[in-house]
């Protein structure tokens, strides 16, 4: 059980001096492990017993072992349920204290009742201030039972609960009808999950026989020892004024544990400290009685005397709870109260004994929880003791529980029980996670959940190429750190698995599920260079490049061309998906823009080195379109075009370009330059007779401008087939070749 104690200081004359302290004796700092364990929580639980709101209570932490609740201003602040929570993880435990008002109408004869499953529990509320009204019993705040006020027996109202089951556990109260709830008698009923002397999931295991009023925990079979006692079976008394599982804590104040109520983890509940009794734990035990609440009787033999804190103090030559055992009787020495082994290991367990006559190898035996008896394989005989060594067969989970070492000689016998915990090595429930990959390395997160028992002492990462029969490579890693697997093969699938270990021999768990992680392609290493480029219009650029010649196949899937427009801070990327390509046409560029251009080889998602950059200036966009283009047939081979100059020109026109195309024809259009920009008409000659033509035109300043509207016109008559159209402007008669 978790070493957690809730202390209530019951000096009730002054509520402001009242305090509750929760003390943890867990290893190291007392909250699960060390200072880093989960903090102790101490609070009033108002879910069942609600009291009028008052100033907030003050919580003070004293180091990591202890937390104290103060700031009670009036007696009603004290009434109700308080809880302390401590321990880490699965061991997180709640300890509960129920406080009754000393001035209440009804007072409990006994606040905490711990009973076994199937028992009959009897709660007894003593009349302190009589009222001639019915008494209402409640369970966890809900109505349960009513007693007529005449039904009091000997000044007490009794509630009998036959055949109790674990769900019956909780806070019970007895209240006079129409009286303040603060005047109720509050009880706590704890129902163990098993019948007397049994524990475990099916209640199949036998309790160790807790001494001195210790209570067997129904889940783990451990004895929860009363304050002031220690040991696997609570067999050992602490020095006066001490408590905690190892007697490591000391009661505050000069009067020791007087006036303190101690509450421990269920199924113990609460009691006075050893040597004290009474509703306020201020009365010393009567002669012949000892222990928590003075519930134990000494019955000392052979001249032993009764100490109210520890029980019988034996004279020389005698030992035992009642001084009933002679020192001649053999005695088990220094047996650990708890041992831990990993599943399927074959540990060696030692058991030492002394006595007169001296124990020999055959007189010491080891008994497992299932009753199997093991005989020692060897014994080491020393002057003061014999140590028997037992080789334990392969451990299974059912071996968890209480083992017993027993020594028998003609002088008598002794036995010592100890707990064996069989732990399951941890097994990852998930595969490690791939974070990033490169051609020769994988970055992996090995942080995985696991089944079985912690703590995790070692994390191993195993990996090898997929479908390989070669040995696994293994590295030991920190489970919360990203791990880089180095020197891998490119473009290769690797099977990666995690293996966890816990402390102790045989603590290595099975390997976790595999996951496939694939390394990236090899990086392309060749650096292209730009051979040349030329502008094919204000928004079109043709680029060509080369690669160095190297032996072997080309490592690459294609090329990436990048155009950086530094003015606008924009990048254009063009993917050329053939590794054989050495030229590309880039379209849709911004006219008049200064671009930085480079090209690089890519393979999978990896880019090779970029070519040295080139700087390219695209010509600016041209002027607006000529207006009102009109076509008029002059003969069977001539058509005259007329137009108006474009508006809002950015500069002087250098020429016009006319596009001629046979309507419905499949051939390429023909472009004819008009080199006299001042003209507004031209004659296109050499056309075919009776043929329909399409015309459009555009102006050029530094770059070609927008096209005009398209016009249609047919040549006249049925003349001879011409050699092809030519142009003649109004001011010049010479033709222009195509």
């Amino acid at each position: 059980a978790v070493d957690l104690t809730l202390l209530a200081n019951l000096r009730l004359t002054d509520p402001q001096r009242f305090f509750l302290t929760c003390v943890s004796g867990e290893a190291g700092a007392g909250r699960g492990s060390d200072a880093w364990g989960p903090p102790l929580l101490l609070e009033k639980d108002d879910r069942i017993v609600r009291t009028p709101p008052g100033p907030p209570l003050r919580l003070a932490r004293n180091g990591s072992h202890q937390v104290t609740l103060r700031g009670f201003s009036k007696p009603s602040d004290l009434v109700g349920v308080f809880s302390c929570v401590g321990g880490a993880g699965a061991r997180r435990t709640r300890v509960i204290y129920v406080h009754n008002s000393p001035g209440a109408h009804l007072l409990p004869d006994k606040v905490t009742h711990t009973v076994n499953k199937g028992d009959t529990a009897v709660l007894s509320a003593r009349v302190h201030k009589e009222k001639q009204t019915d008494v209402i019993w409640k369970s966890n705040g809900s109505y349960f039972y009513t007693l007529d006020w005449h039904e009091a027996q000997d000044g007490r109202f009794l509630l009998q609960l036959p055949n109790v089951q674990p769900p019956s556990s909780g806070i019970y109260s007895a209240t006079y009808l129409e009286a303040s709830p603060l005047g109720s008698a509050f009880f706590r009923l704890i129902v163990r999950g098993c019948g007397a002397g049994r524990w475990g999931p099916g209640c199949t295991k036998e309790c160790p026989g807790c001494l001195h009023g210790g209570v067997c925990h129904d889940h783990d079979g451990e004895c929860v020892c009363p304050p002031g006692f220690t040991g696997t079976r609570c067999e050992q008394a602490c020095r006066e004024g001490r408590f905690g599982q190892s007697c490591q804590e000391q009661c505050p104040g000069i009067s020791g544990c007087r006036g303190l109520t101690f509450c421990l983890p269920d199924p113990y509940g609460c009691s006075c400290g050893s040597g004290w009794r009474g509703s306020q734990c201020q009365e010393a035990c009567a002669p012949g009685h000892f222990g928590a609440d003075c519930r134990l009787q000494c019955q000392c033999q052979n001249g032993g005397t009764c100490d109210r804190f520890s029980g019988c103090v034996c004279p020389s030559g005698w030992h035992g709870v009642h001084c009933e055992k002679s020192d001649r009787i053999p005695q088990i020495l220094n047996m650990a109260s708890e041992l831990e082994f990993n599943l399927e290991t074959m540990p060696r367990i030692n058991c030492a004994a002394a006595g007169n006559p001296f124990p020999v190898r055959g007189s010491i035996e080891l008994r497992k929880p299932d009753g199997t008896v093991l005989l020692s394989t060897k014994a080491i005989v020393e002057p003061e003791k014999t140590t028997a060594e037992f080789e334990v067969p392969r451990l299974v989970l059912a071996d968890s529980g209480f083992w017993e070492c027993r020594v028998s000689t003609s002088g008598g016998q002794d036995s010592r029980r100890f707990k064996v915990n069989v732990k399951v090595p941890p097994v990852p429930l998930a595969a490690p996670r791939l974070l990033t990959k490169q051609s020769r390395q994988l970055v992996v997160s090995p942080l995985v959940s696991f089944s079985g028992d912690g703590p995790i002492s070692t994390v191993r990462l195993h990996y090898r190429p997929q479908d390989s029969t070669m040995d696994w490579s293994t590295i030991v890693v920190d489970p919360s750190e990203n791990v880089t697997l180095m020197n891998l093969r490119p473009k290769t699938g690797y099977s990666v698995r995690v293996q966890l270990s816990r402390p102790g021999e045989g603590g290595e768990g099975a390997w976790g599920p595999p996951t496939l992680m694939t390394t990236d392609c090899p990086e392309p290493l060749l650096q292209p260079w730009l051979e040349g480029w030329h502008v094919e219009g204000t928004d079109r650029l043709r680029v060509s490049w080369s690669l160095p010649l190297v032996p072997g196949p080309l490592v690459g899937d294609g090329f990436l061309l990048r155009l950086w427009d530094g003015t606008r801070g924009q990048e254009r990327r063009e993917n050329v998906s053939s590794p054989q390509a050495r030229t590309a046409l880039l379209t849709g560029l911004t006219p008049g823009t200064h671009y930085q251009l480079d090209v690089q080889l890519y393979h999978c998602t990896l880019l090779g080195p970029a070519s040295p950059p080139a700087h390219v200036l695209l010509p600016p966009s041209g002027p607006p379109a000529p207006r009102h283009l009109h076509a008029q047939a002059l003969s069977d081979s001539e058509i005259q075009l007329t137009w108006k100059h474009p508006e809002a020109l950015p500069g002087p026109i250098s020429k016009y370009v006319v596009e001629v195309q046979v309507a419905g024809g499949a051939g390429d259009p023909l472009w004819i330059d008009v080199d006299r920009p001042e003209e507004t008409s031209t004659i296109i000659r050499g056309l075919n007779a009776s043929t329909r033509y399409l015309f459009r035109m555009r102006a050029s300043i530094q770059g070609l401008g927008d096209w005009s509207n398209t016009v249609e016109e047919s040549t006249l008559g049925n003349g001879l087939q011409a050699e092809g159209p030519v142009q003649e402007s109004r001011a010049a008669e010479e033709g222009l070749d195509q």
Epitope: A27, G28, A29, S33, D34, A35, W36, P38, P39, R61, G63, S64, H65, S445, L447, P455, I456, D478, P479, S480, E481, N482
Partner: antibody, heavy 119, light 107 residues
């Protein structure tokens, strides 16, 4: 690379405020308890504050309680220390330190950032 | 608070010699004690945890011992790079506390 990088130090007047940051990289930041440890010039180490991986539990040294606030942003892999009501005795190099995953000590430290409180 | 006291404050030794550093706690800290090494201008480095376990990558010449209140860090044969300041630290109780440090200098 597994590392911690502090920033935000500098010169501040007594009574002033400063916010230190610690950027973590190369490990699962959200799985670790993180701490601030300081070292006055020519003096020894003093633990200042610690915060659990989820931020649910926080601890302070008595010397800074009520003045300093530790916090973390796991989505940004960053630890913070908000320092208010600064005093001359807070002058120190402030280290961000990671608690080993088994809790046994501080296994990763930053290079530190200097805080000087002076008028 | 748990006070951690280190002695001596300074230890003057030559390379190759054995160094023994002591750390005492004002109350029991079980085995929850760590040792750190700090060189000038650098952050501390974890050497030993839980009183006697070497941290990852720490050479075997460093060893720790003790439990409860008395602890020792031993450097079996000093190397030139071992001259530094060494701190002990407890994690048994809040607040976590460091010792005042022992400076190991070249004689």
């Amino acid at each position: 690379e597994v590392q911690l990088l502090e920033s935000g130090g500098g010169l501040v007047q007594p009574g002033g405020s400063l916010r230190l940051s610690c950027a973590a990289s190369g490990f699962t930041f959200s799985a670790y308890v993180m701490n601030w440890v300081r070292q006055a010039p020519g003096k020894g180490l003093e633990w200042v504050s610690g915060i659990y991986s989820s931020g649910g539990y926080i601890y302070y040294a008595d010397s800074v309680k009520g003045r300093f606030t530790i916090s973390r942003d796991n989505s940004k892999n960053t630890l913070y220390l908000q320092m208010n009501s600064l005093r001359a005795e807070d002058t120190a190099t402030y280290y961000c330190a990671r608690r080993h995953f088994n809790g046994v000590g501080f296994d990763l430290w930053g290079q530190g950032t200097m805080v000087t409180v002076s008028s | 608070d748990i006070q951690m006291t280190q002695s001596p404050a300074t230890l003057s030794l030559s390379p190759g010699e054995r160094a023994t550093l002591s750390c005492r706690a004002s109350q029991s800290v079980s085995s929850y004690l760590a040792w750190y090494q700090q060189k000038p201008g650098q952050a501390p480095r974890l050497l030993i945890y839980d009183a006697s376990n070497r941290a990852t990558g720490i050479p075997a010449r460093f060893s720790g011992s003790g439990s409860g209140t008395d602890f020792t860090l031993t450097i079996s044969s000093l190397e030139p790079e071992d001259f530094a300041v060494y701190y002990c630290q407890q994690r048994s109780n809040w607040p976590l506390t460091f010792g005042g440090g022992t400076k190991v200098e070249i004689k």
